[in-house]
Every structure is written in C-alpha cells, then in structure tokens.
C-alpha cells in the first residue's frame, strides 16, 4: 500500500513567493516620473519577477513632522489620485500581484511615529486600515516600530482589524532592530505578524555569521512563518559586497518563509556606484539612460535591459529562483534541515513528503572547498542520496541538469548550488 500523503498546510498568498518593496515611487520610475499611473506601466515587469506582492509607499499626505498635516486617507497629489490608486489595484489584481500599502505616518520626518502624539497617530492608523481595506488593498506595512511606544499592543490591535476584515489580509511590521530577543518579543505578542528587521544584516561583510543567525532564528521561532530580508527597507547592496549578492538571493529564496526584496535588489542596484544618489533610494536603472547625471557611469550590465538579455546575470538568477520558489512544494512549505559541510559552508535540505527535494550548499568562503556533507546530522526523513541533479549554480560554467556526486562536491569561492533529488521511500 502506498504511504499516505502528508496533509498540505493552509497556504496564504504571501507564503507562495517573494514580496517586492517600492518605497520611493520617483526613484523606482526615474526620468522625473514617479506616480501611480506610471507604476501601473511597470506591473508587467513585476510579473516577470514572479513576485506575489508589491509593498508600496508610503504615498499618503505627510507634511514633515506635522501631525495635523498628515492624512493617511489621502494620497499625496504628487503620486496621483485615489482613482489612479484604484486603477493600479485593479491592474495588479489581474496580474495576480497583491498590493500592500505602507502606512508609516511621518515618513518624510524625523520620527516616523510623532513620538509625542502616539495616541492621535494610532487612531489615524486605525481609521486608515479600515478605509484602505474597503478600498481593496491586500495588506499594510508599518516601519520603524521601535519608535512606537507600546508597539506590541498597537500591532495586535491593527492585526485584529486587518484579520477581522479577512484572513487573507497581511500586516507587515518593520524594525531597525537586529536584536533577536526584541524581535522575538514582538513576534510572541502578534501571532500572524510578518516582521522585517535588520537581524540578518549582522551577518558580517563576509557572511561569516549567516549560518548561525539563520539557524538560531529558525530554532527560536519554531513553526512560525517568518520573512527573510536584510533590513526593513534598504537595498541588499547596503550590507553586502557584490560577491555575496547571488549567494544571498539563493538563500533568501530557499529558506522557509517569505523573502522580501527592495526594488533594485534583483539587479544588484548599488547607490555607491551612482554619485549623488541617496543610499536609501537610488534611481532604478532600467537602461543606460536612467542615470544621465554622469555620462558613462552606468554600463549595460548594471541595468534591467542589459541583465534581461544575459542568462548569467543576477536578474536572470532572481527570476529563476523566484519561479522555483513559487511552484515547488518543498520550497513553498517544506521542512528545513541544516547540516555540517565544512568551514564557510552553509548547507540545508528542503523537503515535503514525497515531493522533489532540494539541497542548498552556499560557500561564504573566498576559497574553493570540497563540501564534506555530514548526512549523519540529518533525520531519517531527510536523508541524502549519492547523487543530485544540479538545478542551478550562482556562477557560470557548470552544466545544469547534470547529476553531481555529493561525496565529491566542490564549490568555487562564493559559489552557491541548488540541487534537486527525488523522494525515495
């Protein structure tokens, strides 16, 4: 008799793939554009990334540090009208892209939460949640919650409103904190909250602490669904050197949870390479004309256009990983088991029942190294085969689809491998 299939977990839409943050409409669209109508024209691009949700804004009216002139129900006219927003929502829905609205109140000011008028602001947020839920948004984001007094109780209340409207609505909270205890205390008081933090940004410029940070986090959060990013808003290049971007893409897409990216992460957008551009929101490089300030500063391989034409680019890797993440059961909701492989190596298995299984091996070292995969660390349900097929490498030169002997697996400096193998009874 065939073994019984394991019962599938309830899957919400944000469990099925990545979220894509566009915090600055003008920087994202460039060329003096930057409104909701223009963003609608970029939805096909988001579809090509296979992301499941767009985290937008804030786009509400906010006079810097002026609570009276901050209206969470009104769209800043610079970004467009309510009609433009409704139109964007409709178009996004047709493309199966959910829209999450950032309601961080004082986003243009010093303290995101007007620290002296917390209750006034909290009431405004409550009203805004109800208003925008009726308008059809799929969720909300609030950032800098470390600046919000009694954050846990406010988040619980806002979560109740959001979930009370529909279980299919999401609340994301963002914090600059990287402290695990602070993060856990926020999570403990809010069951379904998705929390973005700076936790992984402590992994070091060499990625040396990545493995321990990830495993500690997963051990501490248990079966809870989590999100993966390096900060609540900033680009990966703010924290990582170029040679680690591909490794982190592979990791973020294959860990259990929702990967959250900022616009430009898919092409390795780096403010440091664009003189005069703000670190937190550099202009998106659609093509070589996107940054006309300094002629020749932008080469084709830094742009969406250039990388779209290159199968070995970071963008192509992002698209492939996003596609795998959204369709493979083991990556969607599979179990996770990390195991030893050698210095600088982070290796883990994702598996679900009798579905195809995935082995991830990441070399954070700047040396080529043989992976000594310690299968003895794994439970019987997640044993390793002798060979696995190479689905992709973060570096060019390997023959994809070919079976690799796991006993003789050798990785290049800063290489990551995604391998697949079938379930064996």
């Amino acid at each position: 008799r065939a073994p019984r299939c394991r019962e599938l977990p309830a899957q919400k839409w944000w469990h099925t793939g990545a979220l894509y943050r566009i915090g600055d409409l003008q920087a994202f669209q460039g060329h003096g554009a930057g409104n909701l109508a223009g963003l609608k024209g970029r939805l096909d691009y988001l579809s090509s990334l296979k992301v499941k949700g767009l985290v937008l804004g804030p786009i509400h009216k906010n006079q810097k540090d002026d609570v009276a002139q901050t209206d969470l129900l009104q769209i800043d006219p610079n970004f467009g009208s309510k009609e433009d927003f409704d139109s964007l929502l409709q178009s996004a829905k047709k493309k199966s892209i959910r829209v999450i609205l950032d309601l961080t109140p004082n986003y243009r000011g010093e303290n995101s939460w007007f620290s002296t008028q917390v209750d006034t602001v909290a009431t405004k947020v409550k009203d805004a949640l109800e208003f925008w839920l009726q308008a059809g948004v799929d969720g909300f984001q609030v950032r800098d919650i470390e600046n919000l007094k009694d954050a846990s109780s406010f988040l619980a209340e806002w979560q109740n409103i959001t979930k009370g409207f529909s279980e299919d609505r999401l609340l994301i909270a963002g914090t600059n904190s990287s402290d695990l205890q602070q993060i856990l205390s926020l999570l403990e008081s809010n069951k379904d909250l998705l929390l973005t933090s700076s936790y992984l940004s402590d992994s070091g410029s060499t990625g040396e602490h990545t493995k321990s940070l990830v495993t500690q986090y997963l051990n501490a959060t248990g079966n809870r669904w989590c999100s993966w990013s390096l900060s609540q808003a900033r680009l990966l290049t703010s924290f990582l050197p170029a040679q680690l971007l591909r490794l982190y893409q592979l990791m973020l897409f294959t860990l259990p949870g929702t990967p959250v990216f900022s616009y430009g992460d898919e092409i390795g957008l780096d403010a440091a390479a664009l003189p005069g551009q703000p670190m937190e929101a550099p202009v998106m490089l659609w093509d070589e004309s996107s940054f006309p300030d300094i002629p020749g500063a932008v080469s084709a391989n830094m742009t969406v256009k250039g990388q779209s034409e290159d199968p070995g680019s970071l963008l192509s890797l992002f698209r492939r990983l996003s596609d795998q993440r959204s369709k493979e059961r083991s990556l969607l909701h599979g179990d996770f088991h990390a195991f030893s492989a050698g210095p600088g190596l982070f290796s883990y298995i994702r598996h679900w029942d009798q579905n195809e299984r995935f082995l991830v091996v990441l070399n954070f070292g700047d040396v080529g190294l043989s992976a000594g995969l310690q299968a003895s660390d794994l439970p019987a349900s997640a044993s390793l085969p002798a060979k696995a097929d190479l689905l992709l490498s973060t570096q060019p030169g390997r023959e994809e689809g070919s079976p690799l002997e796991l006993e003789r697996l050798k990785l290049e400096p800063h290489e990551g491998l995604l391998l697949r193998f079938p379930y064996a009874a």
Partner: antibody, heavy 119, light 113 residues
Framework: QVQLVQSGAEVKKPGASVKVSCKAS????????MHWVRQAPGQGLEWMGI????????NYAQKFQGRVTSTVDKSISTAYMELSRLRSDDTVVYYC????????????WGQGTLVTVSS | DIVMTQSPDSLAVSLGERATINCKSS????????????LAWYQQKPGQPPKLLIY???TRESGVPDRFSGSGSGTDFTLTISSLQAEDVAVYYC?????????FGGGTKVEIK
Amino acid sequence: QVQLVQSGAEVKKPGASVKVSCKASGYTFTSYWMHWVRQAPGQGLEWMGIIDPSDSETNYAQKFQGRVTSTVDKSISTAYMELSRLRSDDTVVYYCARASYGKGYFDYWGQGTLVTVSS
Amino acid sequence: DIVMTQSPDSLAVSLGERATINCKSSQSLLNNINQKNYLAWYQQKPGQPPKLLIYFASTRESGVPDRFSGSGSGTDFTLTISSLQAEDVAVYYCQQHYSSPFTFGGGTKVEIK
C-alpha cells in the same frame, strides 16, 4: 598584538598520536580561520587542514584525511591539531597559521612545533 | 590539486640590485567573478615561520616594504624585490589560495652575490 603560541617539541614512537596546541591572543579567536601547515627540515611547506573556530567546521587535505583531527577550545582561545598513526616521515615542524574568515592565505603564524617520530 | 612550480631554486643578487622570482600554477588562479588572482608570497628566514608579503598576486600586506611587489595573472606570477637589502636574504614561497588543498611552490633561496 596578535600572537599564536604553540606547544613545545615532542618525541613520539611510530604508530602513536601527537596533539599540538596553538594559543591565540590579541584578536577575536572565533572571527578568523585557523590553518595547519607543516614543513620537513630544509623542505617546503605543506597545507594540512583548516578549522573555523566559531563552529568547529573542518576541511582537510586528502593526504591527511582520517589521520588528522582539528579541534578548538573557545574558552581558552586555543586550537589543536592531532595526528594519529605517526610514521617517521611525520618528523616535521607543524605550524598553526591564522587567516581572515574565508581566506586561504595566512597573515600570522605560530613559532612552530617540531615533532620527532622515532623508535 | 593545483601544482605550484617556482623558479629558480636559488638566486644570488648584489645588494641594491633587482631580484625576480617566478611562480607558475598548473591551473588558472584568476577568479572570473571578481577578477582577482589568488596567489600569495611568503618570506621565510632560518629558524622562523613564514611571513606573508603579498596576497591576491599584488596586494602588499601592511608593514611590508614597498621594494616588494607582486605581478602576474592566470598561471604566471612574479615576485620582485626592486633593490635587495641584506635583511631580504631568505627563502621565498608562492602559494595558491584559490582552492583547497592550498599548495605552495618549492621555494626560492635568495642570497647576496
């Protein structure tokens, strides 16, 4: 300043084991890799293996696989290299050498430990 | 394993003159991703451990005099001492730090003529 101080010279019989220690000071022990390199008298250098003190993950040269074991004691910032089934051609100077995380070149070396294997 | 071959075995140079040591690897040490060559040079004096001089083929370790310079790419590398000093008498080793097992050249003994 960074210092790697190794244990003293040893004389061992063939078939026995030797354990060489390397005490680190002047830096954060767990933030750097420790390599072991050996050198026969008047000869060249030979890499043996590596340990990441933060999680004790190891990697060894094929030639020494099964005979060498690297360990660390983080509480006293000390790395150890044990070589078993000693033969006469293991009569060499053993060095511990520090490398930045993820690197394969060595910026600080211990003073060396001479191990003599003789019956 | 990557084999490292050094030449010459020994070299006698007058004080103040240039000394050149060559190192060849059996496979390329150029990482195409970051365009760096993973080659290091060490100096070893009698009774002492080796001392790092150069890494990534041409990056001088801090505190190393600028008369020491490294060059080359792919499989062919050179260590140059532009003006030999008495304290430079030693054995010099190249080492590939691209891939485990990390391998060394056989060494070049530099003496004063």
